[in-house]
């Protein structure tokens, strides 16, 4: 499919001007190849009417221009002095005519409207409300009012004086007469449809010495805006639609085939299961603008959207809308990164979050996606130290392994960890990505004992059972801060007797504090890692009190104080309910799990052939 | 569980000072978005000003943009609003408050602070500022 995007359909009038906006990805080669717009012949082939290397036909002459825009992915067509026979099909594109890289354009030059003399136009957008003014004379100051609408060749009456609604307007229109010193009256239409656009006719009294004025009305569709996005970005829609809808029901909807547009959500709560986990409504300001946010977007995203106001929360005739046409470039440079993380209860997730390598200063954040009325997205954690005070101890955003990717761990799972999590900064806005965590059946890998009370002065010993399947990661400890877990000295003890069926593979690797302080209180997490990718953590709380007896203290599995979430295990060993990060790329014998919604992704680990958008959890 | 408890408050002239304090108990005071509001007689409780977690930065009602500055301590879990130039009009019970939500909005970013009081989660009993003209 070609990456190069457009309008489908240009309207215009004759003796006006069009511009057309052409998108292409703004990679090197695309920003400085040549740039062309021609016109299809009816047996193919396409000939150039203006080229960014100069070139202009003798048709264009004078009247065109095409204007690159580079850093934008961009290049404007501007058509001045339309005629008729301008109307045609066209192509926007890159490179060679011939070569595909190219849209599609149907241009369509109408005749102006031949509009009798004195005749008044009105431009109102559909929706909208129309005021239609009509004077009158002294001597008609007492008689009918009307207003009628040309209907082939006969005059309708849409409403009068006398009370008169012409069912096609019955609610949304109504008849003013201004007061005695004003000889005007004035026709008030709402909700505008598309069916109300044509000629009126205004009269005042009915006899030969009535006052009549013609008015021609336009009603104008929207046109859509164009919105060129990548593949597993996020798009933002800005509706505005005026202070007079502001306490209407708002709605975002996609068009489907014909007329239908369903919704893709609406502050009445509802939202498109496609769309559950990746989709934002900002509750809407005071003069009735709203803003929707979707993240990872896909191929199939792509399409005609319209925003609009009605009570019911979806498209009627009449809602006063907004329109885009939405682009998916599949020729995304947002990386691919797994939609869906596994972990178990009591274990941890690794979440890997892509991030536009060029803005590395930017401020890096994780929120939970909320999805009660219109969906909330409350920020947990952030990379200036900013940790939600629910999960302290438990939650980490770390840097690594940078370039364009950063890392959240969240250990200790529950099954209320459950749900969707965006990966944000405050840099570019289209990088924004979700997550799913999903809870899996299982034991966490690794064993650390429940929460540890150490003795201010003496010596603590707290060990982290590690299996075999990890022995050729980096083992280590660290003591939790809300500005990440700084590393601490730690002693490989040998292998380790937590694990049935597991060979002198497995490692007991213990953390100790010498001459215990309580500065010492505090969080503790032993974990795994390759390199920068950081695979399973638990994490330990060590509580600090006063001195009672002498001695060093040496925390078995069994021996430490059970936390009421933990469960002891048939072998004497606990379990406390910790949580881990895990990278793809760390668990080669863990086979992924192909998601099903984007089978055409592969997987962003090079250890295994498998795809996957799913990446594995804490153990299988 | 954050427990908050503000002093500072008493009788002062037109055109004076007070400095306000809020006190706040455990150990994740900097999960916290501070905030300062006030209620006068008869009236409904508005919102006077907060602070982000790390005094990085602060918002403000417009009737006391300019006179008022609020601050935090975070190594004594401590937030202050120092009140210049005060008037008639300031008179009232300051309540101090916490919100640990901040959250990301598509229009405005990482919001920190909401001037909501819905948005709080946690409460002072409040300290009354009189202001005598």
């Known amino acids: 499919k070609s990456p190069i995007f457009g309008p489908e359909e240009v309207n215009s009038v004759e003796g006006n001007s069009v511009s057309i906006t052409c998108y292409y990805p703004p990679t090197s080669v695309n920003r400085h190849t040549r740039k062309y717009w021609c016109r299809q012949g009816a047996r193919g082939g396409c000939i150039t009417l203006i080229s960014s290397e100069g070139y202009v036909s003798s048709k264009y002459a004078g009247r065109a221009n095409l204007t690159n825009f580079p850093e934008n992915g961009t290049f404007v067509v501007n058509i001045a002095q339309l005629s008729q026979d301008d109307s045609g099909r066209y192509k926007c594109g890159l490179g060679i005519n011939s070569r595909g890289l190219s849209f599609d354009v149907s241009l369509e030059v109408s005749q102006g409207p031949g509009l009798l003399n004195d005749t008044k136009v009105y431009t109102v957008d559909l929706g909208r409300t129309v005021t239609i003014n009509c004077p009158f004379k002294t001597e008609n100051a007492q008689k009918r009012k009307s207003l009628y609408k040309q209907i082939g060749l006969y005059p309708v009456l849409v409403i009068d004086s006398s009370g008169y609604v012409n069912p096609n307007y019955t609610g949304r229109i109504r008849l003013d007469i201004q007061g005695t010193g004003q000889l005007l009256f004035s026709v008030v239409i709402n909700q505008l449809r598309l069916s109300d656009a044509g000629q009126y006719l205004c009269q005042a009294g009915d006899d030969s010495n009535s006052n009549k004025k013609n008015a021609d009305l336009q009603v104008l569709k929207p046109e859509p805006e164009l919105v060129y996005e990548d593949l597993r970005g996020s798009v933002t829609f800005h509706c505005a639609l005026g202070p007079e809808v502001a306490n209407v029901a708002k709605f975002l909807c996609r068009q489907s085939s014909g007329e239908n547009c369903d919704v893709v959500v609406n502050t009445l709560g509802k939202r498109a299961p496609a769309f559950e986990g990746r989709i934002l409504l900002n509750p809407q300001d005071k003069d009735g603008s709203f803003s929707v946010v979707i993240t990872g977007l896909r191929k199939e995203d792509a399409g005609r959207y319209l925003c609009g106001a009605h009570s019911d929360g979806q498209l009627q005739e009449g809602s006063p809308i907004q329109a885009w046409q939405l682009f998916v470039n599949e020729e995304s440079t947002i990386p691919r990164s797994p939609t869906v993380v596994k972990g178990v209860a009591g274990g941890s997730v690794a979440v890997l979050c892509p991030y536009n390598r060029k803005e590395s200063k930017s401020i890096k954040y994780w929120c939970l996606w909320e999805g009660a009325q219109n969906g909330r997205c409350p920020l947990l954690v952030d990379s200036e130290g900013w940790v939600k005070a629910q999960y302290e101890g438990r939650l980490s955003l770390l840097e690594e392994p940078g370039n364009g990717t950063f890392t959240v761990i969240l250990n200790q799972l529950t099954s209320r960890d459950a749900g969707f999590y965006w990966c944000l900064t405050n840099g570019d806005t289209l990088w924004r990505t979700t997550v799913e965590i999903k809870i899996i059946e299982g034991e966490p890998n690794l064993k650390v004992p429940g929460n540890v009370t150490a003795v201010l002065g003496e010596t603590l010993k707290v060990p982290c059972h590690f299996p075999c399947k990890f022995s050729s990661y980096e083992k280590y400890w660290c003591k939790w801060n809300n500005t990440g877990c700084q590393a601490l000295p730690s002693q490989d003890e040998g292998p380790s007797k937590a694990f049935v069926n597991c060979d002198e593979n497995s490692r007991l690797v213990s953390l100790t504090l010498n001459l215990v302080t309580r500065a010492d209180e505090g969080w503790y997490w032993c974990g795994v890692k390759q390199g920068h990718f950081y695979g399973e953590t638990a994490a330990v709380y060590v509580a600090v009190e006063e001195r009672k007896a002498a001695g060093s203290r040496d925390v078995s599995l069994a021996k430490a104080d059970a936390a009421p979430d933990e469960k002891v295990l048939d072998s004497g060993f606990r379990e406390i309910e910790n949580k881990a990060i895990q990278d793809p790329r760390l668990f080669a014998e863990e086979k992924a799990v192909a998601d099903t919604r984007d089978q055409a992704d592969g997987s962003r680990a090079s250890v295994d052939s498998g795809s996957s958008e799913e990446q594995g959890g804490s153990s299988r | 569980e954050v427990q908050l408890v503000e002093s500072g408050g008493g009788l002062v002239q037109a055109g004076g000072s007070l400095r306000l304090s809020c006190a706040a108990s455990?150990?994740?005071?900097?999960?916290?978005?501070m905030g300062w509001f006030r209620q006068a007689p008869g009236k409904e409780r508005e919102f006077v000003a907060a602070?982000?977690?790390?005094?990085?930065?602060?918002y403000y009602a417009d009737s006391v943009k300019g006179r008022f500055t609020i601050s935090r301590d975070n190594a004594k879990n401590t937030v202050y609003l120092q009140m210049n130039s005060l008037k008639p009009e300031d008179t009232a019970v300051y309540y101090c408050?916490?919100?640990?939500?901040?959250?990301?909005?598509?229009?405005?970013?990482?919001?920190?602070?909401?001037?909501?009081?819905?948005?709080?989660?946690?409460w002072g009993q409040g300290t009354l500022v009189t202001v005598s003209s």
């Open positions: 602070i982000k977690w790390n005094g990085g930065s602060t």
């Open positions: 408050a916490a919100d640990g939500d901040p959250y990301f909005s598509p229009t405005d970013g990482i919001v920190w602070h909401a001037p909501h009081q819905s948005e709080y989660d946690y």
């Open positions: 455990g150990r994740t005071f900097t999960s916290y978005t």
